[in-house]
């Protein structure tokens, strides 16, 4: 007995479609071997019509496909525009037609139900609205109008002009009789159910003079749109369900193995924990359409997704739905980058963000995912240099290392910085990625003064102590502005006493400002890097005051003050929305930090070698 299983008999009518699902044991060999659908000829040979390797016979061109679902151990053959000629004996199978594992399927395509003459056919998707038009003659204008459903040989009253409504259609049907002169009445059925499918009869009047019109209503399930996305990438489901449900709760759900649909996210605040940090439901437009973005795609995200509308925020019969079949390509063009980056309180992280290397000129963005309600992602920084106010002095987006990767550095970390962040551009939306920042126990590796007050016109020397493990790294100082961090000359001053457990390789690198000017006020970063890969950073704020005492100042960690208070954000934040693909601005207006001035002047010195730290502190 073959372990392949499927429908032994399939019957349909001309013009219809069939979807034949064949099941196989999902062993490693079976999952990857060729799948086929062939037709058995008189000679006993089975001629391939469609296969998983992309072959489609001329007879099936444009109307058939075969899709393998290796995780489920199934493949599906879809055949559209059936004709009587398609009737016959077929096999669905694995391997080679003549000696592989297979299952016999008989397909019978008939002419279809004989419809009475003059029958109007209405083809509508489930959950949508149909308007059935029913003409009548003048003499029947004052008489009763009705719609019946034909079930076998009987006719069941659905609605009439005497206010009768069949309980199966309660609250979703209405009969409209126009003003004088218009010889047509209409029946509108909302939220169509699959059970509404069938033959209907409009009737006006009674007896031999009555007017009758037949209507064949075909209620269809939506065909899933096939969506192929890369592992680690992003997918956007655009859901347009129509104005009728514009004010009804929306949802996205995923069909499970029992063929029920588990809510992934809805507008009532429900969200599947498997999508934490990597999903957004974008607010709907006036027409009721909305979209759901999922980033950081995993293989297990594959499957059938439905979006819909219902007051309960979940799938219910008779409400409009849209369907997708998501495939996640494991041979991804999106490079691996850490999904979790760890940093210590007071320390820093450097996050590597991938982007499509063909779009090097695209604007780069970094936003903070917020889970409240439908999820949102307020923009924190962008490559044009705009930084949200409360991140002033501690956040920077760098174009390096380039060629498909940019870097985001966040320092002065606190436990409040833990969370999910998204890397994105105004270009290819499929390259959106998610990274989680975790704050762990530990001490920052770089030590700088907390707060420095410099005297106008004098010399300021700011030390940055680094441990021996960074001895081979390039050290740098830079002056932060909302357009980046401009590198400054610094002085490697030899051994440091800040790391008592370290040998003579523990050093300090100093920044000297000579003479101090008003323009020198602002944030300075000390950091380490290796080539274009950034490691840890430490930030210090320099305040400039009028000269009180002559002489130069050398600031050591012992004299450091607390960091200055952060500014409070009082403006609206910009967030990801549907326009992300086309609109380089991406998000709604917000207040922007003023540029903190020109780079500092002063003495210049050479810089040491270079580096990037492991995942505690950088994304290398």
């Amino acid at each position: 007995k073959s372990p392949v299983f499927g429908p032994q008999e399939v019957s349909s009518v001309e013009g219809n479609s069939v979807s034949i699902k064949c099941y196989y044991p999902p062993t490693s060999v079976n999952r990857h071997t060729r799948k086929y659908w062939c037709r058995k000829g008189a000679s006993g040979r089975c001629i391939t019509l469609v296969s998983s390797e992309g072959y489609v016979s001329s007879n099936y061109a444009g109307r058939a496909n075969l899709t393998n679902f290796p995780e489920n151990g199934t493949f599906v053959v879809n055949i559209a525009q059936l004709s009587r000629d398609d009737s016959g004996h077929y096999k669905c199978g694995l391997g080679i037609n003549s000696r592989g594992l297979s299952f016999d399927v008989s397909l019978e395509v008939s002419q279809g139900p004989e419809l009475p003459n003059g029958t109007e056919v209405y083809t509508v998707d489930v959950g949508r609205t149909v308007t059935i038009k029913c003409p009548f003659k003048t003499e029947n204008a004052p008489k009763t109008k009705a719609l019946y459903k034909k079930i076998g040989q009987t006719s069941v009253l659905v609605i009439d002009s005497r206010n009768y409504v069949n309980p199966n259609y309660k609250d979703r049907i209405r009969l409209r009789i126009p003003g004088t002169g218009q010889l047509i009445f209409t029946v509108v059925i909302d939220r169509l159910r699959l059970s509404d499918h069938g033959l209907y009869l409009c009737q006006a009047g009674d007896g031999s003079n009555r007017d009758e019109k037949n209507a064949d209503l075909q209620v269809l399930e939506p065909e899933p749109e096939l969506v192929y996305e890369d592992l680690r990438g992003s997918v956007t489901f655009h859901c347009a369900l129509g104005l009728e449900v514009a004010n009804v709760a929306k949802f996205l759900c995923r069909v499970n193995s029992r063929e029920t649909c588990d809510v992934v996210i809805n507008t009532l605040g429900k969200r599947d924990s498997a999508f934490e940090g990597r999903i957004l439901l974008n607010p709907q437009d006036k027409d009721g359409s909305f979209s759901v973005v999922i980033t950081g795609l995993r293989k297990e995200d594959e499957g059938r997704y439905l979006c819909g509308a219902h007051s309960d925020g979940q799938l219910q019969e008779g409400w409009p739905i849209q369907a997708w079949q998501l495939f996640v390509n494991e041979e991804s063009t999106i490079p691996r980058s850490p999904t979790v980056v760890k940093g210590v309180a007071g320390g820093s992280v450097a996050v590597l963000c991938p982007y499509n290397p063909k779009e090097s000129q695209s604007l780069k963005y970094w936003c903070l995912w917020e889970g409240a309600q439908n999820g949102r992602c307020p923009l924190l920084v962008e490559s044009q240099g705009l930084v949200q106010e409360q991140y002033e002095g501690r956040l920077s987006l760098l174009q390096e290392p380039g060629n498909g990767t940019f870097t985001v550095i966040l320092n002065q970390l606190t436990t409040q910085d833990a969370g999910f962040y998204w890397c994105l551009t105004n270009g290819d939306t499929r390259w959106r990625t998610t990274v989680e920042i975790k704050i762990i126990e530990g001490e920052p590796n770089l030590k700088v003064p907390g707060n420095v007050t410099a005297v106008l016109g004098e010399t300021l020397n700011i030390p940055c102590h680094f441990p021996c493990k960074f001895s081979s790294y390039e050290k740098y100082w830079c002056k932060w502005s909302n357009t980046g961090c401009q590198t400054l000359p610094s002085q490697d001053e030899g051994p440091s006493e800040a790391f008592v457990n370290c040998d003579e390789n523990s050093r300090l690198v100093s920044l000297t400002l000579n003479p101090v000017t008003r323009a020198d006020e602002g944030w300075y970063w000390c950091g380490v890097k290796q080539g274009h890969f950034y490691g840890e950073t430490a930030a210090v704020y320099v305040a400039v005051e009028e000269k009180k005492v002559a002489g130069s100042r050398y600031v050591s960690p012992a004299k450091a003050d607390a960091a200055p208070d952060e500014k409070v954000l009082d403006s609206g934040v910009r967030e990801i929305e549907n326009k992300a693909i086309q609109d380089p601005r991406l998000f709604a207006e917000e207040k922007v930090v003023a540029d903190t001035g020109d780079q500092a002047g002063g003495s210049r010195a050479s810089v040491d070698s270079s580096s990037s730290e492991e995942q505690g502190g950088s994304s290398k």
Partner: nanobody
């Protein structure tokens, strides 16, 4: 709520025929799946046959042990599914259960009991040798 009521069971001689019917009440099944399972004394419940439909398209599935002998069919107007059993064998003796599901999405493997939402009480078929 959907109720499923089986009928047509009884005692029959080997080689004989029986026709089981399953009537679904409480909800229109214009699209979905209905199936037959059976449980012989001391054995686990097993798949016999199933029928899935949507609009004018129907899919019929059979267990290898009944292929060519049993035929499943559906009468839309009466909301019933029948199982015509020919060439009955003593090993067909079992309680036969009707099962049904209605879903907006295509079903999974029809042989799986978890695929069905509603079950009947069962009807006994005894085939004597």
């Amino acid at each position: 709520q959907v109720q499923l009521v089986e009928s047509g069971g009884g005692l029959v001689q080997a080689g004989g025929s029986l026709r089981l019917s399953c009537a679904a009440s409480g909800r229109a099944f214009s699209s979905g799946r209905m199936g037959w399972f059976r449980q012989a004394p001391g054995k686990e419940r097993e798949f016999v046959a199933a029928i899935s439909w949507s609009g004018h398209t129907t899919y019929k599935y059979y267990a290898d042990s009944v292929k060519g002998r049993f035929t499943i069919s559906r009468e839309n107007a009466k909301n019933t599914v029948s199982l015509q059993m020919n060439s009955l064998k003593p090993e067909d003796t079992a309680v036969y259960y009707c099962a049904a599901r209605q879903s907006l999405v295509a079903g999974g493997d029809p042989r799986g009991q978890s695929e069905y939402d509603y079950w009947g009480q069962g009807t006994l078929v005894t085939v004597s040798s």
